[in-house]
Protein backbone atom coordinates (compact mmCIF):
# COMPACT_ATOMS: atom_id res chain seq x y z
CA UNK A 1 0.00 0.00 0.00
CA UNK A 2 0.95 3.52 -0.44
CA UNK A 3 2.35 5.42 2.43
CA UNK A 4 0.58 7.00 5.43
CA UNK A 5 -1.70 9.73 4.36
CA UNK A 6 -0.65 13.47 5.51
CA UNK A 7 -2.60 14.04 8.89
CA UNK A 8 -6.18 16.00 8.78
CA UNK A 9 -8.01 17.81 12.01
CA UNK A 10 -11.25 15.61 11.37
CA UNK A 11 -12.70 18.56 12.83
CA UNK A 12 -12.48 20.53 10.18
CA UNK A 13 -15.11 18.42 8.17
CA UNK A 14 -17.68 17.20 10.64
CA UNK A 15 -20.46 19.00 9.06
CA UNK A 16 -19.95 16.95 6.26
CA UNK A 17 -21.16 13.45 7.58
CA UNK A 18 -24.36 13.59 9.74
CA UNK A 19 -24.35 9.49 10.21
CA UNK A 20 -22.20 7.13 10.71
CA UNK A 21 -19.46 6.28 7.92
CA UNK A 22 -20.57 3.27 5.26
CA UNK A 23 -16.40 2.63 5.44
CA UNK A 24 -13.29 3.41 5.84
CA UNK A 25 -12.81 5.01 2.36
CA UNK A 26 -15.77 7.42 3.07
CA UNK A 27 -13.96 8.21 6.30
CA UNK A 28 -11.19 9.06 4.00
CA UNK A 29 -13.15 11.64 1.93
CA UNK A 30 -14.48 13.57 4.78
CA UNK A 31 -11.14 14.06 6.10
CA UNK A 32 -9.90 11.33 9.11
CA UNK A 33 -6.37 10.29 8.24
CA UNK A 34 -5.47 8.16 11.01
CA UNK A 35 -5.64 4.63 10.79
CA UNK A 36 -7.25 2.57 13.83
CA UNK A 37 -10.57 0.82 14.65
CA UNK A 38 -13.72 2.79 13.55
CA UNK A 39 -17.98 1.97 13.40
CA UNK A 40 -18.96 2.44 10.05
CA UNK A 41 -22.25 1.49 9.11
CA UNK A 42 -22.73 0.48 5.58
CA UNK A 43 -26.25 1.13 3.89
CA UNK A 44 -29.16 -1.82 4.91
CA UNK A 45 -26.36 -2.99 7.93
CA UNK A 46 -26.21 -2.77 11.62
CA UNK A 47 -23.46 -0.94 12.87
CA UNK A 48 -19.92 -2.63 13.16
CA UNK A 49 -15.97 -1.87 14.08
CA UNK A 50 -13.78 -2.23 11.51
CA UNK A 51 -9.51 -1.94 10.76
CA UNK A 52 -9.37 1.14 8.71
CA UNK A 53 -5.98 1.55 7.31
CA UNK A 54 -5.63 5.42 6.22
CA UNK A 55 -3.04 5.06 2.96
CA UNK A 56 -2.55 8.47 0.28
CA UNK A 57 -4.15 6.38 -1.98
CA UNK A 58 -7.77 6.74 0.50
CA UNK A 59 -8.63 4.33 3.26
CA UNK A 60 -9.32 0.75 3.03
CA UNK A 61 -10.78 -2.21 5.31
CA UNK A 62 -8.83 -4.75 6.79
CA UNK A 63 -10.65 -7.98 6.24
CA UNK A 64 -7.81 -10.53 7.48
CA UNK A 65 -5.33 -10.77 9.52
CA UNK A 66 -2.67 -13.36 10.81
CA UNK A 67 0.11 -12.75 12.29
CA UNK A 68 1.03 -15.14 15.44
CA UNK A 69 -1.03 -18.08 15.27
CA UNK A 70 -3.28 -17.04 18.21
CA UNK A 71 -6.54 -17.70 16.29
CA UNK A 72 -8.09 -21.49 15.08
CA UNK A 73 -8.97 -20.20 11.30
CA UNK A 74 -10.39 -23.70 10.62
CA UNK A 75 -13.97 -22.85 11.22
CA UNK A 76 -17.46 -23.82 9.48
CA UNK A 77 -19.15 -21.84 7.16
CA UNK A 78 -21.15 -19.20 9.46
CA UNK A 79 -18.15 -18.57 11.23
CA UNK A 80 -16.39 -17.50 8.07
CA UNK A 81 -19.87 -15.48 7.01
CA UNK A 82 -20.32 -13.65 10.60
CA UNK A 83 -16.51 -12.97 11.09
CA UNK A 84 -14.35 -14.50 14.53
CA UNK A 85 -11.03 -13.44 16.07
CA UNK A 86 -9.54 -10.54 17.52
CA UNK A 87 -9.83 -6.93 16.11
CA UNK A 88 -6.46 -6.05 17.86
CA UNK A 89 -4.75 -9.07 16.31
CA UNK A 90 -5.55 -11.90 13.95
CA UNK A 91 -9.01 -11.94 12.74
CA UNK A 92 -11.38 -12.86 9.63
CA UNK A 93 -13.91 -9.53 9.46
CA UNK A 94 -16.78 -11.58 8.17
CA UNK A 95 -18.21 -12.34 4.40
CA UNK A 96 -21.54 -10.61 4.94
CA UNK A 97 -19.59 -7.38 6.16
CA UNK A 98 -17.18 -7.18 3.57
CA UNK A 99 -19.95 -8.34 0.84
CA UNK A 100 -22.39 -5.09 3.02
CA UNK A 101 -19.13 -2.79 2.65
CA UNK A 102 -18.77 -3.95 -1.08
CA UNK A 103 -22.35 -4.01 -2.39
CA UNK A 104 -22.48 -4.20 -5.80
CA UNK A 105 -19.69 -2.42 -6.72
CA UNK A 106 -16.17 -3.37 -7.58
CA UNK A 107 -13.11 -3.07 -5.58
CA UNK A 108 -9.83 -3.14 -5.02
CA UNK A 109 -8.78 -5.78 -3.01
CA UNK A 110 -5.02 -5.59 -1.56
CA UNK A 111 -2.91 -8.52 -0.13
CA UNK A 112 0.19 -8.27 1.44
CA UNK A 113 2.45 -11.10 2.38
CA UNK A 114 5.27 -11.85 4.73
CA UNK A 115 8.07 -14.50 4.91
CA UNK A 116 9.82 -15.70 7.73
CA UNK A 117 12.95 -13.84 6.48
CA UNK A 118 11.55 -10.46 6.42
CA UNK A 119 10.51 -10.12 2.70
CA UNK A 120 7.24 -9.17 1.79
CA UNK A 121 5.17 -8.90 -1.22
CA UNK A 122 1.83 -6.40 -2.28
CA UNK A 123 -0.67 -7.64 -4.66
CA UNK A 124 -3.86 -6.07 -5.68
CA UNK A 125 -6.55 -6.91 -7.44
CA UNK A 126 -9.39 -5.64 -8.89
CA UNK A 127 -12.43 -7.98 -7.77
CA UNK A 128 -16.25 -7.97 -7.17
CA UNK A 129 -17.69 -10.15 -4.41
CA UNK A 130 -20.69 -11.61 -4.50
CA UNK A 131 -23.66 -12.45 -2.12
CA UNK A 132 -24.32 -15.25 -0.21
CA UNK A 133 -27.03 -16.44 -2.85
CA UNK A 134 -23.25 -16.80 -4.88
CA UNK A 135 -21.44 -18.18 -1.88
CA UNK A 136 -19.38 -15.05 -1.53
CA UNK A 137 -18.10 -15.64 -5.29
CA UNK A 138 -14.66 -13.71 -5.95
CA UNK A 139 -14.43 -12.72 -9.51
CA UNK A 140 -11.58 -10.53 -10.85
CA UNK A 141 -12.55 -7.66 -13.09
CA UNK A 142 -8.82 -6.95 -13.88
CA UNK A 143 -5.45 -8.42 -14.23
CA UNK A 144 -3.52 -8.84 -11.31
CA UNK A 145 -1.31 -5.87 -10.14
CA UNK A 146 2.63 -7.45 -9.02
CA UNK A 147 5.06 -9.38 -11.21
CA UNK A 148 3.08 -12.91 -9.43
CA UNK A 149 0.89 -13.64 -12.97
CA UNK A 150 -2.69 -14.75 -13.57
CA UNK A 151 -1.67 -18.39 -11.95
CA UNK A 152 -1.77 -17.22 -8.18
CA UNK A 153 -6.05 -16.41 -8.50
CA UNK A 154 -8.87 -17.71 -10.91
CA UNK A 155 -8.48 -16.04 -14.46
CA UNK A 156 -9.88 -12.93 -15.06
CA UNK A 157 -13.68 -12.92 -15.50
CA UNK A 158 -13.85 -16.50 -13.72
CA UNK A 159 -15.74 -16.70 -10.57
CA UNK A 160 -14.48 -18.91 -7.36
CA UNK A 161 -17.52 -19.00 -4.38
CA UNK A 162 -15.79 -19.39 -1.01
CA UNK A 163 -16.04 -22.47 0.48
CA UNK A 164 -15.41 -24.10 4.40
CA UNK A 165 -15.07 -27.28 5.04
CA UNK A 166 -18.97 -27.70 6.00
CA UNK A 167 -19.88 -25.81 2.41
CA UNK A 168 -17.82 -26.93 -0.43
CA UNK A 169 -18.47 -24.90 -3.38
CA UNK A 170 -14.62 -25.39 -4.82
CA UNK A 171 -14.38 -26.25 -8.42
CA UNK A 172 -12.64 -29.70 -7.75
CA UNK A 173 -15.17 -32.42 -8.28
CA UNK A 174 -13.09 -35.15 -6.37
CA UNK A 175 -12.23 -33.10 -3.65
CA UNK A 176 -13.28 -31.24 -0.94
CA UNK A 177 -10.22 -28.53 -0.72
CA UNK A 178 -11.08 -26.94 2.62
CA UNK A 179 -11.62 -30.38 4.32
CA UNK A 180 -8.45 -31.74 2.80
CA UNK A 181 -6.38 -28.32 3.79
CA UNK A 182 -7.68 -25.77 6.12
CA UNK A 183 -9.87 -22.58 7.03
CA UNK A 184 -12.38 -21.29 4.34
CA UNK A 185 -11.09 -19.84 1.19
CA UNK A 186 -11.88 -18.77 -2.17
CA UNK A 187 -10.96 -22.22 -3.46
CA UNK A 188 -10.17 -23.30 -7.35
CA UNK A 189 -8.41 -26.80 -7.59
CA UNK A 190 -6.86 -26.40 -4.11
CA UNK A 191 -3.13 -25.35 -5.37
CA UNK A 192 -3.30 -21.58 -5.89
CA UNK A 193 -3.22 -20.17 -2.29
CA UNK A 194 -4.81 -20.59 1.32
CA UNK A 195 -4.21 -17.41 3.15
CA UNK A 196 -6.77 -19.02 5.71
CA UNK A 197 -4.94 -21.64 6.36
CA UNK A 198 -3.10 -23.43 9.29
CA UNK A 199 -0.74 -21.47 11.04
CA UNK A 200 2.88 -22.94 11.23
CA UNK A 201 5.19 -21.51 13.73
CA UNK A 202 8.02 -24.04 12.06
CA UNK A 203 8.13 -26.14 8.83
CA UNK A 204 6.66 -29.55 9.43
CA UNK A 205 8.37 -32.31 7.72
CA UNK A 206 5.43 -33.96 6.38
CA UNK A 207 4.39 -32.74 2.74
CA UNK A 208 0.87 -33.88 3.96
CA UNK A 209 0.50 -31.84 7.04
CA UNK A 210 2.17 -28.80 5.06
CA UNK A 211 -0.41 -28.02 2.34
CA UNK A 212 -2.64 -27.32 5.29
CA UNK A 213 -0.38 -23.86 5.66
CA UNK A 214 -0.86 -20.52 4.74
CA UNK A 215 0.59 -20.30 1.14
CA UNK A 216 0.53 -18.64 -1.82
CA UNK A 217 2.29 -20.78 -4.52
CA UNK A 218 3.18 -17.96 -6.80
CA UNK A 219 5.48 -16.20 -4.02
CA UNK A 220 6.85 -18.23 -1.82
CA UNK A 221 5.70 -21.89 -3.10
CA UNK A 222 3.05 -24.25 -2.72
CA UNK A 223 4.29 -25.50 -0.06
CA UNK A 224 6.17 -22.44 2.24
CA UNK A 225 4.12 -21.47 5.32
CA UNK A 226 3.77 -17.55 5.25
CA UNK A 227 4.48 -15.79 8.41
CA UNK A 228 2.27 -12.79 8.25
CA UNK A 229 -0.66 -12.01 5.70
CA UNK A 230 -3.11 -9.20 5.56
CA UNK A 231 -6.40 -8.24 3.01
CA UNK A 232 -7.87 -5.12 2.57
CA UNK A 233 -10.58 -3.96 0.71
CA UNK A 234 -11.88 -0.57 -0.95
CA UNK A 235 -14.77 -0.17 -3.01
CA UNK A 236 -14.52 1.90 -6.22
CA UNK A 237 -16.85 4.81 -7.22
CA UNK A 238 -20.15 3.41 -7.84
CA UNK A 239 -19.93 4.32 -11.86
CA UNK A 240 -16.89 2.07 -11.84
CA UNK A 241 -18.95 -1.23 -10.91
CA UNK A 242 -19.61 -3.23 -13.97
CA UNK B 1 -17.04 23.09 19.04
CA UNK B 2 -18.15 20.09 20.50
CA UNK B 3 -18.94 21.46 24.55
CA UNK B 4 -18.97 18.55 26.81
CA UNK B 5 -20.38 18.42 30.36
CA UNK B 6 -20.20 15.87 33.24
CA UNK B 7 -22.24 15.86 36.13
CA UNK B 8 -23.76 13.00 39.08
CA UNK B 9 -20.03 13.18 40.65
CA UNK B 10 -19.69 13.48 44.46
CA UNK B 11 -18.92 11.76 47.99
CA UNK B 12 -20.23 8.04 48.63
CA UNK B 13 -19.38 5.23 50.83
CA UNK B 14 -17.39 2.27 49.73
CA UNK B 15 -19.76 0.00 47.99
CA UNK B 16 -21.67 2.72 46.90
CA UNK B 17 -22.96 3.59 43.45
CA UNK B 18 -22.75 6.80 41.31
CA UNK B 19 -24.41 7.65 37.87
CA UNK B 20 -22.18 10.03 35.74
CA UNK B 21 -23.48 11.88 32.86
CA UNK B 22 -22.18 13.40 29.98
CA UNK B 23 -23.91 16.08 28.14
CA UNK B 24 -23.04 17.18 24.91
CA UNK B 25 -23.54 19.88 22.54
CA UNK B 26 -24.13 18.81 19.13
CA UNK B 27 -26.65 17.86 16.41
CA UNK B 28 -24.87 14.87 15.30
CA UNK B 29 -23.95 13.25 18.72
CA UNK B 30 -24.41 9.59 17.27
CA UNK B 31 -21.52 9.65 15.43
CA UNK B 32 -19.57 10.55 18.74
CA UNK B 33 -17.37 7.79 19.59
CA UNK B 34 -17.06 9.00 23.63
CA UNK B 35 -15.03 7.91 25.90
CA UNK B 36 -14.41 7.92 29.95
CA UNK B 37 -11.56 8.57 31.87
CA UNK B 38 -10.20 9.41 35.01
CA UNK B 39 -6.97 11.08 37.10
CA UNK B 40 -6.08 10.34 40.65
CA UNK B 41 -4.26 12.55 42.75
CA UNK B 42 -0.64 12.49 41.75
CA UNK B 43 -1.48 9.81 39.08
CA UNK B 44 -1.70 10.27 35.08
CA UNK B 45 -5.23 10.35 33.41
CA UNK B 46 -6.20 6.60 32.32
CA UNK B 47 -8.65 4.98 30.38
CA UNK B 48 -12.06 3.66 31.97
CA UNK B 49 -14.42 2.76 29.24
CA UNK B 50 -15.82 3.70 25.85
CA UNK B 51 -19.23 3.19 23.90
CA UNK B 52 -19.93 4.03 20.02
CA UNK B 53 -21.46 6.37 18.23
CA UNK B 54 -24.50 3.76 17.94
CA UNK B 55 -24.00 2.08 21.51
CA UNK B 56 -23.57 -0.89 19.48
CA UNK B 57 -19.93 -1.27 20.61
CA UNK B 58 -17.94 -0.60 24.51
CA UNK B 59 -15.07 -1.76 26.42
CA UNK B 60 -13.51 -0.78 29.99
CA UNK B 61 -10.40 -1.09 32.06
CA UNK B 62 -9.70 -4.60 33.55
CA UNK B 63 -10.16 -2.18 36.85
CA UNK B 64 -13.58 -1.24 36.53
CA UNK B 65 -15.12 -4.31 34.62
CA UNK B 66 -18.18 -5.47 36.12
CA UNK B 67 -18.43 -3.02 38.36
CA UNK B 68 -19.35 0.03 35.83
CA UNK B 69 -21.38 -0.24 32.56
CA UNK B 70 -21.66 2.57 30.13
CA UNK B 71 -24.43 3.59 28.02
CA UNK B 72 -25.99 6.56 25.96
CA UNK B 73 -29.00 7.66 24.60
CA UNK B 74 -28.62 9.51 21.51
CA UNK B 75 -31.85 11.48 21.58
CA UNK B 76 -30.61 13.11 24.98
CA UNK B 77 -26.83 13.90 23.52
CA UNK B 78 -25.91 12.02 26.39
CA UNK B 79 -23.86 9.03 27.63
CA UNK B 80 -24.01 7.61 31.12
CA UNK B 81 -21.45 5.90 33.23
CA UNK B 82 -22.81 3.47 36.16
CA UNK B 83 -20.78 3.26 38.79
CA UNK B 84 -21.42 -0.09 41.11
CA UNK B 85 -19.37 -1.47 44.38
CA UNK B 86 -17.22 1.96 44.51
CA UNK B 87 -13.57 1.35 46.22
CA UNK B 88 -11.52 3.83 47.39
CA UNK B 89 -9.02 3.25 44.39
CA UNK B 90 -11.69 5.00 42.22
CA UNK B 91 -11.36 8.30 43.65
CA UNK B 92 -10.47 10.49 41.10
CA UNK B 93 -11.54 13.18 38.65
CA UNK B 94 -13.97 11.82 35.69
CA UNK B 95 -13.38 13.17 32.16
CA UNK B 96 -15.98 12.42 29.35
CA UNK B 97 -13.55 12.60 25.88
CA UNK B 98 -15.55 12.86 22.37
CA UNK B 99 -14.48 11.53 18.99
CA UNK B 100 -15.93 12.13 15.67
CA UNK B 101 -16.86 9.29 13.15
CA UNK B 102 -16.16 6.61 15.74
CA UNK B 103 -13.14 5.77 16.61
CA UNK B 104 -12.23 2.94 18.75
CA UNK B 105 -9.71 3.75 21.12
CA UNK B 106 -8.94 3.60 24.90
CA UNK B 107 -5.75 6.40 24.08
CA UNK B 108 -6.89 10.28 25.17
CA UNK B 109 -4.52 10.94 22.69
CA UNK B 110 -7.41 10.02 20.44
CA UNK B 111 -10.10 12.75 21.48
CA UNK B 112 -10.98 15.75 20.21
CA UNK B 113 -13.09 17.16 22.75
CA UNK B 114 -13.05 17.29 26.38
CA UNK B 115 -15.28 17.98 29.53
CA UNK B 116 -14.00 19.79 32.82
CA UNK B 117 -14.39 16.49 34.76
CA UNK B 118 -16.23 15.76 38.09
CA UNK B 119 -15.26 14.98 41.09
CA UNK B 120 -15.71 11.13 42.45
CA UNK B 121 -14.53 10.28 46.30
CA UNK B 122 -15.05 7.36 47.98
CA UNK B 123 -14.86 7.02 51.30
CA UNK B 124 -13.88 3.78 52.96
Known amino acids: LPEMAQPVDPAHNVSRLHRLPRDCQELFQVGERQSGLFEIQPQGSPPFLVNCKMTSDGGWTVIQRRHDGSVDFNRPWEAYKAGFGDPHGEFWLGLEKVHSITGDRNSRLAVQLRDWDGNAELLQFSVHLGGEDTAYSLQLTAPVAGQLGATTVPPSGLSVPFSTWDQDHDLRRDKNCAKSLSGGWWFGTCSHSNLNGQYFRSIPQQRQKLKKGIFWKTWRGRYYPLQATTMLIQPMAAEAAS | EVQLVESGGGLVQAGGSLRLSCAAS????????VGWFRQAPGKEREFVSI????????DYADSVKGRFTVSRDNAKNTVYLQMNSLKSEDTAVYYC?????????????????WGQGTQVTVSS
Open chain 2, 97 to 113: AARHWGMFSRSENDYNY
Open chain 2, 26 to 33: VLTFGTYT
Open chain 2, 51 to 58: ITGSGTYN
